[in-house]
């Protein structure tokens, strides 16, 4: 059957009907419903929400909706033994203690089960010692401290400001520097936008607000006790000493009121430059230790959190495809939150709910998508992407054979300025074409397309007249699908103006103040940005599931491969003496990129000309497109990161949130001048060039004529 036969409605009408059915008022209602109580992973409240979503998705008309449960390692504070940090005097008396909880927002004073701020998976411990201020605790910050300033963090408690990089990387860096504890805090320079009031009068972070979050370094492993395999009823679990990615030193987060008390006494070295100064009225001295009058005082951490194997629940909904039921397009976002989840994740979950409702409405009218659509409400994302990863581990054989695309649906907004998209190059043209058909919600762009406002506000740095689309990194549920399984993936949300707002993320991220009211009063009162994000996410899913030929353009991969090869080559050429000494050649990589470009171009020509009424040829061409992303997977994975298997993209080794291109070569080159054995180090560079060149060539050959 053709797509039109199977669906009984013309394709154009389908898409229009689907988009027209999406309503801002519904998203608003759903967001309210999802944010009235906390939905922490592993709690009864989040299980009840899973059952509610299961029931509603069934009502909306999905063919089946099942719960998929796993027993994974989670982390919680001890209810009777709270975590805190003290300043102690020479007698060991606590002369200052950090707060035990965030002051609840108005209207939420009587809500129970608000988890106090903590760093999930911190080990227990009560270290005491001198403080060292380490800026953002990035790799380069520790280089500055250790190499330039000759400051030794060994045996010290470090205090780092949140922002710039994933908190787990900060903790890893502190551990490697020999620290015995880490204090994380939100500096107003990063979490308080000038001219905006703090919550509840605006969207800024108050002094008592604190960012929760996990501090794992999982590198894509999922449940720390069952890496590579689902945490099911008969799972073999590692002992805690062999668990993947757990931090080895105590870690705790605080707000800027408490940080002020710790930082105002700091002595030792002055900050190396202005980039180490935040906005508090403190000197930002690096330390170690407190200044003269307070030099006998120390900092002591009191951490009593516990790691517990706990049951989590994903909700998996299926809308069976009429023509190709064995081809899966997946829309997934998480449901678990740190507290109320006003933005993260429920602004995304509410959009998914409305997308499901719209698809269900069409299905009830007799329509079906060409391909199967799977909808997922993931659990335990905040604890390390656990729900999505365990499900993908359990279903990996199906996914690697049948997975067409994965669209992520976490927070719909992190601002209200313009669209932000991160995706595989295969989806660039899909995103461009879709956004040209959607109306912009932006003031001053009435009657203009989303593409136009997006391009104006966030132009591509390389191509004039086109919008910026970023590389996929990690820190969200697409990770296992893209980085491990090689399924084409994308994400979209509304974002802030990065030019004028330099704070990291949004100020109230992972705090108790991330409420429904935050969104309804300050970010999107009309829910028009939510609706636009629903149209983008839903529209992408619709096209991926319903277009006769998959809406992937392999030529866009050729363009970025050349750009990434150029970039990694230029990084390598910064070491000309070693390049020459070890005769490091990039010929194989540039040759492979050239071949990929030529083969992709020929494939695109054949794609225009083939007989689309021949179902065998159609399926063959679509399979070549579907499996192209898969062809970039190296079954052996990246060095020391076996679950990051994509050769073109991986999360940066220095910031999980950021994507790195040709990560194997990049990591081999990183700080190569400090390696003790240069010959071995440059040998690894050459090996990584070989792996990259082979992979690009092999991927190119999947696009060649089959015989």
């Amino acid at each position: 059957k053709s797509s039109n036969e199977a669906t009984n409605i013309t394709p154009k009408h389908n898409m229009k009907a689907f988009l027209d059915e999406l309503k801002a008022e519904n998203i608003k209602k759903f967001l309210y419903n999802f944010t009235q109580i906390p939905h922490l992973a592993g709690t009864e409240q989040n299980f009840q929400l899973a059952k509610q979503i299961q029931s509603q998705w069934k009502e909306f008309g999905l063919d089946s909706v099942e719960l998929a449960h796993y027993d994974v390692l989670l982390s919680y504070p001890n209810k009777t033994h709270p975590n805190y940090i003290s300043i102690i005097n020479e007698d060991g008396n606590e002369i200052f203690n950090t707060s035990l909880f965030e002051p609840p927002p108005p209207g939420y004073e009587n809500v129970s089960d608000i988890v106090p701020p903590f760093s999930a998976f911190s080990p227990q411990g009560m270290p005491e010692g001198d403080l060292v201020y380490v800026n953002y605790a990035r790799t380069e910050d520790f280089f500055k401290l250790e190499r330039d300033m000759k400051i030794n963090c060994s045996g010290k408690i470090v205090i780092a400001r949140y922002g710039k990089v994933f908190r787990g990387n900060k903790v890893k860096n502190a551990q490697l520097a020999g620290a015995k504890g880490v204090i994380l805090y939100s500096d107003p320079a990063d979490y308080f936008a000038p001219g905006v009031k703090s919550y509840p009068d605006g969207w800024n972070l108050p002094g008592g607000g604190v960012q929760r979050g996990n501090i794992l370094n999982l590198n894509g492993a999922g449940d720390p006790l069952t890496p590579g395999y689902p945490a099911n009823e008969y799972a073999y679990r590692r002992g805690i000493a062999e668990a993947v990615g757990l931090p080895s030193i105590p870690v705790h987060p605080i707000g800027y009121y408490d940080a002020q008390k710790l930082l105002e006494k700091m002595g030792g070295s002055a900050p190396p430059d202005s980039s180490w100064r935040g906005s508090l009225k403190v000197p930002y001295n690096v330390g170690p230790g407190f200044t003269g009058n307070f030099s006998t005082q120390k900092v002591k951490m009191h951490i009593h959190s516990t790691n517990e194997v706990t049951r989590i629940y994903n909700v998996i909904g299926t809308l069976r495809g009429a023509v190709e039921p064995d081809r899966y397009v997946i829309l997934g976002g998480h449901r678990d939150s740190w507290v109320f989840g006003g933005i993260d994740p429920q602004s995304g979950a509410a959009v998914v709910h409305e997308i499901v409702r719209s698809f269900g409405t069409l299905k009830k009218e007799g329509w079906r998508p060409r391909r199967t659509i799977l909808f997922a409400s993931w659990d335990a994302e905040e604890f390390g992407l656990l729900g999505s990863t365990e499900w993908a581990e359990e279903n990996s054989r199906l996914l690697q054979e049948r997975g067409v695309a994965y669209i992520n649906a976490d927070s719909s907004i992190e601002g209200n300025y313009t669209l932000r998209v991160d995706c595989t190059p295969l989806m660039y043209s899909l995103v461009h074409n879709l956004t040209k058909e959607l109306k912009s919600p932006d003031e001053g762009f009435e009657g203009k397309s989303l593409y136009e406002s997006w391009t104006k506000k966030s132009p591509s740095p390389e191509f004039s007249g086109m919008p910026r689309i970023s590389k996929l990194g990690s820190g969200n549920d697409f990770e296992v699908f893209f980085q491990r399984l090689g399924i084409a993936s994308g994400r979209a949300r509304y974002t802030k103006n990065w030019e004028t707002n330099k704070f990291s993320g949004y100020p109230l991220y992972h705090s108790v103040y991330e409420t429904y009211e935050l969104v309804e009063k300050f970010y999107d009162p009309m829910f028009k940005y939510h609706l636009t994000v629903a149209q983008v996410r839903g529209g992408m899913v619709f096209e991926l599931a319903n277009s006769i030929v998959l809406p992937f353009d392999c030529r866009d991969y050729a363009v970025v491969l050349r750009k990434y090869a150029d970039k990694i080559y230029s990084i390598s050429m910064k070491h000309p003496q070693e390049m020459k000494t070890y005769s490091v050649s990039f010929d194989s990589l540039f040759s492979a990129v050239k071949n990929f470009t030529e083969i992709a171009s020929k494939f695109s020509e054949r794609l225009q000309d083939f007989d689309k009424s021949n179902p065998i040829v159609l399926r063959m061409m679509n399979d070549q497109l579907m499996f192209l992303e898969r062809a970039f997977i190296d079954p052996l994975g990246l060095p020391d990161r076996p679950f990051y298997r994509h050769v073109i993209y991986a999360p940066s080794s220095h910031n999980k949130y950021a994507g790195e291109s040709f990560p194997g070569i990049y990591d081999a080159l990183f700080d190569i001048e400090s390696k003790v054995d240069p010959s071995k180090a440059w040998g690894e560079v050459k090996r990584q060039i070989y792996v990259a060149a082979f992979t690009v060539q092999a991927a190119a050959e999947t696009l060649s004529e089959v015989a």
Epitope: K563, Y569, M573, S583, S585, F586
Partner: nanobody, 112 residues
Framework: EVQLVESGGGLVQPGGSLRLSCTVS????????VSWVRQAPGQGLEWVSS???????YYADSVKGRFTISRDNSKNTLYLQMNSLRAEDTAVYYC??????WGQGTLVTVSS
């Protein structure tokens, strides 16, 4: 056989300009990134600039804003336009494909 031949070096006064050329053969020039590298008297090799197959340009901090790298694929030629030259730019300038393929170099002397 890959060949890279530099030309355009010479003596120039501080503040002056020079344009170096590098003509290549033996490979499909348009498909490869290429670079300029220099070696000052008694010093090691120093990367100056690269231009990608896609035309993207990269510069060392020491020359940013003063030097411009470009390529003409139809002529199989790489260029380096050097403006506001300083005494510390004095060096032998090499055209390089990567670590394996280099030219013989052309001497640039900046002196009053």
């Amino acid at each position: 056989e890959v060949q890279l031949v530099e030309s355009g070096g010479g003596l120039v006064q501080p503040g002056g300009s020079l344009r170096l050329s590098c003509t290549v053969s033996g490979f499909t020039f348009s498909s490869y990134a290429v670079s300029w590298v220099r070696q000052a008297p008694g010093q090691g090799l120093e990367w100056v600039s690269s231009i990608g197959a896609g035309g993207g340009t990269y510069y060392a901090d020491s020359v940013k804003g003063r030097f411009t790298i470009s390529r003409d694929n139809s002529k199989n030629t790489l260029y380096l336009q050097m403006n506001s030259l300083r005494a510390e730019d004095t060096a032998v300038y090499y055209c390089a494909k990567d670590g394996a393929d280099w030219g013989q170099g052309t001497l640039v002397t900046v002196s009053s």
